[in-house]
């Protein structure tokens, strides 16, 4: 995870002035996945390459956020661009962040994990237990390494949360899961909440 | 009850390359990991690789980056194991291994010895 | 990577003993430690995992303890069937790794 946007990023630096106006224009027509939401229009518009990069990982997340770029610049004519955005798809295509699953737009839903970012981030203590129930499955090696660098729990909890706008639904899942096991009480005392 | 039944012996050539397989049942195949090991004869064991089989991801030691590629077929629970450009030196037996939680090993399968001689 | 030692490659035990066998991490390995036995005929069980957790369907005559980098698997009423050889791995880093093993045998 990471590298996505990354690629997303670099093609869209990429792009002259015009081809960017004309790849926004572009993305608010495009046909979108079910469960999907577009970005609108006023705020779109007004974005520089980084800006657009961040909002189409937040709304539609690395894996489908790339496959909509690729899309979009295939009917822009950009063939080379899409390519290698392409390859990216192909080579990072592992991690459970890069399964298809439809984000159910967590903005609107709001998942346990957004709602209460910051009082898991004050409360859990018992990080590593969180980490071994993510690896592999949801966080990568490298991702696991970092998180467990972190000196303090807060550190570590907000290092594991700077990966989660890359995550889909059933990643988000999986923290809450791993937290029910680990923080039962923690849990239930934010449910209430 | 889980159980990891790993395919019979390999009489290869040097240069060759093997797949050998892992065929995993009792559990969900997908929820867990399954790692490979390696251990020439009278000697300690050598951890190769592992795959996460609900996602593909899989993480090699750099030892064996390019001798061993780890799939996974989850229509039949089967893990695979292939080595490439064979030597002596990959004579050995393999074991495949389930991953638990703290990635121990919990469940280990009986092993396939690959012998490679011309 | 880090290196797992076990000091002591073979150990002979009379029948009732307590056995200690040891494992030494090259740095800390905060608990991620593991215990294999390997029988004679090859199969491998997982004993202790993460330090002292023991493994379900285990005899409670094998325990283990240690933290940083020392750790330690003991039988504390060593039995014929325990004739093996033990084996200890790290999973806390990449390459993950196992000890040269430790040969039990009865005196």
């Known amino acids: 995870m990471g590298r996505a946007r990354d690629a997303i990023l670099d093609a869209l630096e990429n792009l002259s002035g015009d081809e960017l106006k004309k790849f926004k224009m572009k993305l608010l027509t495009v046909q979108l996945r079910e469960g999907y939401g577009r970005i609108p229009r006023g705020a779109l518009l007004q974005m520089d390459a980084i800006d657009l990069t961040d909002k189409l990982v937040s709304y539609y997340l690395e894996s489908y956020g790339l496959e909509l770029t690729m899309t979009v610049l295939r009917d822009m004519g950009l063939q080379e661009l899409a390519e290698q955005l392409q390859t990216t798809k192909e080579e990072s295509g592992a991690v459970a962040a890069a399964a298809s699953v439809p984000a159910q737009s967590t903005a609107r839903t709001g998942h346990f994990v957004d709602q209460h970012r910051q009082a898991l981030i004050a409360r859990v203590t018992e990080v590593d237990g969180v980490l071994d129930a993510l690896h592999g499955s949801v966080l990568t090696e490298g991702q696991y390494q970092a998180v467990r660098a972190e000196t303090t729990s807060q550190d570590k909890m907000r290092k594991l949360f700077s990966f989660v706008p890359s995550w889909n639904l059933t990643c988000k899942d999986s923290l809450l899961q791993a937290l029910k096991e680990i923080h039962p009480y923690l849990v239930m005392d934010l449910e209430q909440s | 009850e889980v159980q990891l039944q790993q395919s019979g012996a390999e009489l290869v050539r040097p240069g060759s390359s093997v797949k050998m397989s892992c065929e995993t049942s009792?559990?969900?195949?997908?929820?867990?990991?399954l790692t490979w090991v390696k251990q020439r004869p009278g000697q300690g064991l050598e951890w190769i690789g592992y795959?996460?089989?609900?996602?593909?991801?899989?993480e090699y030691n750099e030892k064996f980056k390019d001798k061993a590629t780890l799939t996974s077929d989850t229509s039949s629970s089967i893990v695979y194991m292939q080595l490439s450009s064979l030597t002596s030196e990959d004579s050995a037996i393999y074991f495949c291994?389930?991953?638990?939680?703290?990635?121990?090993?919990?469940?280990w399968g009986q092993g396939t010895t690959l012998t490679v001689s011309s | 990577a880090i290196q797992m030692t076990q000091t002591t490659s073979s150990l002979s035990a009379s029948l009732g003993d307590r056995v200690t066998i040891s494992c030494r991490a090259s740095q800390d390995i905060s608990n991620y430690l593991h215990w294999y036995q390997q029988k004679p005929d090859g199969t491998v069980k997982l004993l202790i995992f993460?330090?002292?957790g023991l493994r379900s369907g285990v005899p409670s005559r094998f325990s283990g303890s240690g933290s940083g980098t020392d750790y330690s698997l003991t039988i504390s009423n060593l039995e014929q069937e325990d004739i093996a050889t033990y084996f200890c791995q790290q999973s806390i880093l990449l390459p993950w790794t196992f000890g040269g093993g430790t040969k039990l045998e009865i005196k």
């Open positions: 795959i996460y089989v609900g996602n593909g991801y899989t």
């Open positions: 993460f330090t002292s």
């Open positions: 291994a389930r991953l638990g939680l703290r990635r121990h090993f919990d469940y």
């Open positions: 009792g559990y969900t195949f997908t929820t867990y990991g």
